[in-house]
């Protein structure tokens, strides 16, 4: 039975040209994490494998940095970066947990962080 929950940074906004940290946290489970994937829509941005560490997808390596922790830092943001991002936790024995973050990249300097929320 999957008892865990993923807490994410929720709906967030950031300025064009700036950077943003995408964070997820898996709690309320003793399951062991074998790998965390970060995806934007259907594109894999990066993985963090429990054994072998971080691997940034070649097409994103200039604008994506690993961490902090199991989070992901997006740099040199453009308006095209607006959209949904997913953290996918592969665990055993529970299986897969997915968290969703919506990022809006703004032209102006009025970027504010949204509230945190949980996905069961």
């Amino acid at each position: 039975m999957m008892t865990g929950t993923i807490e994410t940074t929720g709906n967030i906004s950031a300025e064009k040209g700036g950077s943003i940290i995408l964070q997820c946290h898996l709690s309320s489970t003793t399951a062991q994490v074998t790998q965390v994937n970060w995806e934007q829509q259907d594109q894999l941005l990066a993985i963090c494998n429990a054994d072998l560490g971080w691997h940034i997808s070649p097409s994103f390596k200039d604008r994506v940095a690993p961490g902090p922790g199991l989070g992901l830092t997006l740099q040199s943001l453009t308006v095209n970066d607006t959209g949904e991002y997913f953290c996918i936790y592969h665990t055993y024995p529970d299986g897969t947990y997915t968290g969703r973050i919506f990022l809006e990249v703004l032209e102006s300097s009025v970027a504010e962080h949204g509230a945190r929320f949980q996905i069961p």
Epitope: Q32, T34, Q35, N37, E39, L44, I47, N49, A50, D51, L52, G53, W54, H55, S57, P58, I88, H90, T91, Y92, P93, D94, G95
Partner: antibody, heavy 125, light 106 residues
């Protein structure tokens, strides 16, 4: 086609070291991890560890920690496994193997679809 | 480490027989279980990954099932080329293999 070609058989004295090579071809070397498995004569398969050909990170079986080093040379698409302080019970066929899934598949890794032909290492005084 | 126990350690069967090999993990590994076939003097060959996914090029007479701690490899109709040793392997860190099951001709 996709293949892994290993170096030839070795005979070593107890206490010596051995370095086995594994040359990959037919695929993008840095997109897949390489694992090492050994098999003593008449025995089963033993997981030794694996290495990311992308970032060089390694993870070794606990019983071999301190004696084994796995490395890669991306310029030649070659993986290496060095085992030190050899003992008679290290006599085995050593295999390198490529993971079924690339890092960019997003799948959890750990099953091996392409294997080298094996390298027999004999440790004897 | 997670221990993998295979049974039986050996079995005798005839061409056309249905053969079942089991693998039990000492703790739950979800579906992180792979099956290999090995013939004497050869490297192992991947048959099944993620408990039930058939590897490309492997005949459909091979199938895998199970999750958690109990897993099964089934050969629906044994062929002459299937006489070999079969190993399960769990892919939860740190990875380990079962002790093997030798399938011999009756």
């Amino acid at each position: 086609q996709v293949q892994l070609v290993q170096s030839g058989a070795e005979v070593k004295k107890p206490g010596a070291s051995v370095k086995v090579s594994c040359k990959a071809s037919g695929y993008t070397f840095t997109s897949y991890p390489i694992g090492w498995v050994r098999q003593a004569p008449g025995q089963g398969l033993e997981w030794m560890g694996w290495i990311s050909s992308y970032n060089g990170n390694t993870n070794y079986a606990q019983k071999l920690q301190g004696r084994v080093t796995m490395t890669t040379d991306t310029s030649t698409s070659t993986a290496y496994m060095e085992l030190r302080s050899l003992r008679s019970d290290d006599t085995a066929v050593y295999y390198c193997a490529r993971d079924l899934k690339s890092f960019w598949s997003g799948d959890v890794l750990g099953a091996f679809d392409i294997w080298g032909q094996g390298t027999m290492v004999t440790v004897s005084s | 480490d997670i221990q993998m126990t295979q049974s039986p350690s050996s079995l005798s069967a005839s061409v056309g027989d249905r053969v079942t090999i089991t693998c039990r993990a000492s703790q739950s590994i979800s579906s992180y279980l792979n099956w290999y076939q090995q013939k004497p003097g050869k490297a192992p060959k991947l048959l099944i990954y993620a408990a039930s996914s058939l590897q490309s090029g492997v005949p459909s007479r091979f199938s895998g099932s199970g999750s958690g701690t109990d897993f099964t490899l089934t050969i629906s109709s044994l062929q002459p080329e299937d006489f070999a040793t079969y190993y399960c392997q769990q892919s939860v860190p740190p990875r380990t293999f079962g002790g093997g099951t030798k399938v011999e001709i009756k």
